[in-house]
């Protein structure tokens, strides 16, 4: 089983938006949800 880390560095690239993974609760943005570390 893959373990999920909030700082995994996962990026979402679609519709010309890029959400860079940061720690949950960071001051970088709001948690998008249902992904790994995505904030915006």
């Amino acid at each position: 089983d893959a373990e999920f880390r909030h700082d995994s560095g996962y990026e979402v690239h679609h519709q010309k938006l890029v959400f860079f993974a940061e720690d949950v609760g960071s001051n970088k943005g709001a948690i998008i949800g249902l992904m790994v570390g995505g904030v915006v």
């Epitope: 979402v12 679609h14 943005g29 709001a30 948690i31 998008i32 949800g33 249902l34 915006v40």
Partner: antibody, heavy 121, light 111 residues
Amino acid sequence: QVQLVQSGAEVKKPGASVKVSCKASGYTFTTYAIHWVRQAPGQGLEWMGFTSPYSGVSNYNQKFKGRVTMTRDTSTSTVYMELSSLRSEDTAVYYCARFDNYARGYVRDYWGQGTLVTVSS
Amino acid sequence: DIVMTQSPDSLAVSLGERATINCRASESVDNDRISFLNWYQQKPGQPPKLLIYAATKQGTGVPDRFSGSGSGTDFTLTISSLQAEDVAVYYCQQSKEFPWSFGGGTKVEIK
């Protein structure tokens, strides 16, 4: 406790616009994006998009071709979804929702109670 | 856009028996060994509730009789021993790419 409370039912004529609100409480408003999902009567679920209360950035389902606008008011912890150029096929229950990211041990979802929007001449 | 297809459309199962729902994605919903596939339960007049995330992980407070399996494009939700309170419509959803998309739903009833 986390709560998402939506505005009441609306009846609109074709071509009009509707603005549905979703008031968040029980957590820090700016830490979670708010998504909108709709469900036509007797039909399935359709994701419309989300907005970030932190940045104001939104991402919309292109199916709605510029008809949808999602905004937020941080002073009242409220997110709004406006849908314009309404047609009968837009008759649906509109839900706002908040989701955790994938994490070890927990993922929670929270949903508003739903707002029925009826489009009829 | 990723298209999610569920089968069957409806399912009648006896109390205590197993219920199996299938979901197929038009392309892989995997990324870096994680399947971005979620399952929801919706009862009449209520919003959906997250049951399973990342294909196999149980949501908070979800009974152990609900389990998920699969990867890539093919996924399954299993209710190991159907209870009366499990009567609902079940949806799969992908969160790999925007726009997020849902399957058409599977209605589970008591036989």
